[in-house]
Amino acid sequence: KAMHVAQPAVVLASSRGIASFVCEYASPGKATEVRVTVLRQADSQVTEVCAATYMMGNELTFLDDSICTGTSSGNQVNLTIQGLRAMDTGLYICKVELMYPPPYYLGIGNGTQIYVIDPEPCPDSD
């Protein structure tokens, strides 16, 4: 089955290369196991940025080397992506899968355009 996933249209990363946004899904049932995947589309290519499976009421657990962190509250997931540079500017898409109990539901957001501006280096002081 399909479900609606909402996310902001645009986010500007901080000067430290951190971007946060909320991914909200309209759960048609009482899911206990949810999988959230962040995709990036740029230059006609889609890649997986990070993914986490979590039990409702528990924290999201990404892999240790992941650039993503997140928390969940009800049907909302607060995602943070760090270590971003200007070359990472692109459309970041939230994909939500309700894994358990059946039936399986899948929803994909319209994407959040994340703009990353590399900070200017500090000028040398005399």
């Epitope: 089955k1 399909a2 995947t37 589309q41 006609s44 997986e48 399986y104 994909i108």
Partner: nanobody, 130 residues
Framework: EVQLVESGGGLVQPGGSLRLSCAAS????????LGWFRQAPGKGREAVST???????SYADSVKGRFTISRDNAKNTLYLQMNSLRPEDTAVYYC????????????????????????WGQGTLVTVSS
Amino acid sequence: EVQLVESGGGLVQPGGSLRLSCAASGYTYSRHCLGWFRQAPGKGREAVSTISSGGSTSYADSVKGRFTISRDNAKNTLYLQMNSLRPEDTAVYYCAIGPNPRYCSGAPATRGAEHYFGYWGQGTLVTVSS
């Protein structure tokens, strides 16, 4: 439970034709994007063609003018008519549903577009050989 079942694959000579079908059950998918993908031996899955709920179609450059996608919403069935088949068309062909139509038209030109789809069938093997 959603089920997608492909059929129509087989062995065909170069220049021949095949018509693939994908029957869906447990899902009212007329408002979403439907797609055909293929995976050749030792290669990744690639989008071949997509069709929107309004009937707009898109094709990978490699199949344009040879393949035609269509859908019958009343029968919950997706089709792929394949003409002028070439040895490089040999692959397992899958149908899939994309829940967000925003990514429908661009999928065949996008590497990794399979991320936008779900509810995959088991696939049907197409072999083009003399």
